[in-house]
């Protein structure tokens, strides 16, 4: 058995994911995880699922974070700006935003980086998953530390 | 005793701490912190170690920040961005890097101000020590509460 | 009773809040937040008050932070940067500044979105508020998820 | 591509001391992890001590902790291996070794000969009794 999952009794196990991005060819704005390099899945009760949510089976209360790391140029890039959403599905529910920050493009040649930070508490209901869409993944950075997403349980 | 070690009981005491930054003359690229201004530090199981690495006594799941602010200037600056790493050095093993964000210098004269934060849950043995290292420390801003490092175990 | 409240015993309760921001004609420089939208108030032992400040009824260890997305423009502001600061007030104590970001302003036209993040751990008394503060509420984004404040007690 | 050249063996008599040191040339050393193995005739080369690229931290080998000191000096771009009350069975050539500290894997150990990149050519410590 886990031994985060021990730490706080059987009633009431550590529940925490740090999970590392991946680069992806598919044409979603839905970014990809890996459970790869430095991550943490504590145990069963929170899972990454097909590279791009993490899913809970506990109600309660998360603090859950993304970072975003993105190279972009002002003329190379739509007039809006770089957008990261931290974004809630809920079993029978719609799909809803829970957090977004916007960066506007860097004029720096030929992209100029930022980093973006999200987090926040918000209450979770068994089975439901998290994740982050960004307006351009191709933009995204993907070095060493750079882009990550997480959750632990309160 | 401290307050907060009593809190959750003698076998599972709080663990947390927020140092804040210090200027510091030294040729290196680890920032420097000091127990001041409105800082935490727990009790024993976690230290500040020669100013600069937070050590912690307890295997575990760690939620660790660094919050960074520095002015820095296109012309300036090398044409690498300003980048700050969050980074672990554990017993017997190589420092590595757990969190990274980067900002494209601004051309704001004669420096421009911007704020990185990094934030992320880690595991950490026994002994482990987790740092902040940028590109160029000369830039970073050492005013009330722009520039913050600390953890809090799960 | 609130589940939240139950989960860790009644000794022990889960303290939580995440409230999300308020478009205010007020001439003020502190943010105003509303229990609106996907908000988090975990019991009554933290409560928004006055829509601007967050009161804790309970001393302890606390993960304080704060998400603010401004959209400003170089030549129509001022020269200095656009600062948010998280701030402190306790019960017979002078307010005080816990954390504080700073961000240059865009030269992009009208102008141009940026996020920033701040968090940290500090102990707070019994009856302590905390609150945010920024150099130009006029420039703050209210849309959904930009703008939002909260906290956890350990 | 780092040189690393060592100096400082020679002949001591056991309860004496030497200071070992590796000047390294080339690209700029701040980003290496540094460390110094041994390899006494007919045995194996092993882990001595090394020293954290950022931090300046230390790892040693359990038995050698008490009598040898690893410190680097950056700004010569040098690394120091301090060795006190040696004893016959220290004698060995001593070697020098880097280590680039950036993309390194969860499981790697700085005692692991394997995860060094650059080596020098050594230095030979003669301990007589």
């Known amino acids: 058995e886990n031994s985060f999952e021990m730490q706080k009794g059987d009633q009431n196990p550590q529940i925490a994911a740090h999970v590392i991005s991946e680069a992806s060819s598919k044409t979603t704005s839905v970014l990809q995880w890996a459970e790869k390099g430095y991550y943490t899945m504590s145990n069963n009760l929170v899972t990454l699922e097909n590279g791009k949510q993490l899913t809970v089976k506990r109600q309660g209360l998360y603090y859950i974070y993304a970072q975003v790391t993105f190279c972009s140029n002002r003329e190379a890039s739509s007039q809006a700006p770089f957008i990261a959403s931290l974004c809630l599905k809920s079993p029978g529910r719609f799909e809803r935003i829970l957090l977004r920050a916007a960066n506007t493009h860097s004029s720096a040649k030929p992209c100029g980086q930022q980093s973006i930070h999200l987090g926040g508490v918000f209450e979770l209901q068994p089975g439901a998953s998290v994740f982050v869409n960004v307006t351009d993944p191709s933009q995204v950075s993907h070095g060493t530390g750079f882009t990550s997403f997480g959750l632990l349980k309160l | 005793e401290n307050s907060f070690e009593m809190q959750k009981g003698d076998q599972n005491p709080q663990i947390a701490a927020h140092v804040i930054s210090e200027a510091s003359s030294k040729t290196t690229s680890v920032l420097q912190w000091a127990e001041k201004g409105y800082y935490t530090m727990s009790n024993n199981l976690v230290t500040l170690e020669n100013g600069k690495q937070l050590t912690v006594k307890r295997q575990g799941l760690y939620y660790i920040y660094a919050q960074v602010t520095f002015c820095s200037n296109r012309e300036a600056s090398s044409q690498a961005p300003f980048i700050a790493s969050l980074c672990l050095k554990s017993p017997g093993r190589f420092e590595r890097i757990l969190l990274r964000a980067a900002n494209t210098h601004s051309s704001a004269k004669p420096c421009g101000q911007q704020s990185i934060h990094l934030g992320g849950v880690f595991e950490l043995q026994p002994g482990a020590s987790v740092f902040v290292n940028v590109t160029d420390p000369s830039q970073v801003s050492h005013g009330t509460g722009f520039t913050s490092f600390g953890l809090l175990k799960l | 009773e609130n589940s939240f409240e139950m989960q860790k015993g009644d000794q022990n309760p889960q303290i939580a809040a995440h409230v999300i921001s308020e478009a205010s004609s007020k001439t003020t420089s502190v943010l105003q937040w509303a229990e609106k939208g996907y908000y988090t108030m975990s019991n009554n032992l933290v409560t928004l008050e006055n829509g601007k400040q967050l009161t804790v009824k309970r001393q302890g260890l606390y993960y304080i932070y704060a998400q603010v997305t401004f959209c400003s423009n170089r030549e129509a502001s001022s020269q200095a940067p656009f600062i948010a600061s998280l701030c402190l007030k306790s019960p017979g104590r002078f307010e005080r500044i816990l954390l504080r970001a700073a961000n240059t302003h865009s030269s992009a036209k009208p102008c141009g979105q940026q996020s920033i993040h701040l968090g940290g751990v500090f102990e707070l008394q019994p009856g302590a508020s905390v609150f945010v503060n920024v150099t130009d509420p006029s420039q703050v984004s209210h849309g959904t998820g930009f703008t939002s404040f909260g906290l956890l007690k350990l | 591509e780092v040189q690393l050249v060592e100096s400082g063996g020679g002949l001591v008599q056991a309860g004496g001391s030497l200071r070992l040191s590796c000047a390294a040339s080339?690209?700029?050393?701040?980003?290496?992890?540094m460390a110094w193995f041994r390899q006494a005739p007919g045995k194996e080369r092993e882990f001595v001590a090394a020293?954290?690229?950022?931090?300046?931290?230390?790892d040693y080998s359990d038995s050698l902790k008490d009598r040898f000191t690893i410190s680097r000096d950056n700004a010569k771009a040098t690394l120091y291996l301090r060795m006190n009350n040696l004893k016959p069975e220290d004698t060995a050539v001593y070697y020098c070794?880097?280590?680039?500290?950036?993309?390194?894997?969860?499981?790697?150990?700085?005692?692991?000969?394997?995860?060094?990149?650059?080596w020098g050519q050594g230095t030979l410590v003669t301990v007589s009794s």
């Open positions: 070794a880097a280590r680039e500290t950036t993309h390194i894997s969860t499981s790697d150990r700085v005692n692991e000969m394997r995860h060094y990149d650059y």
């Open positions: 080339g690209r700029t050393p701040l980003n290496y992890h």
């Open positions: 020293i954290s690229s950022l931090l300046g931290s230390t």
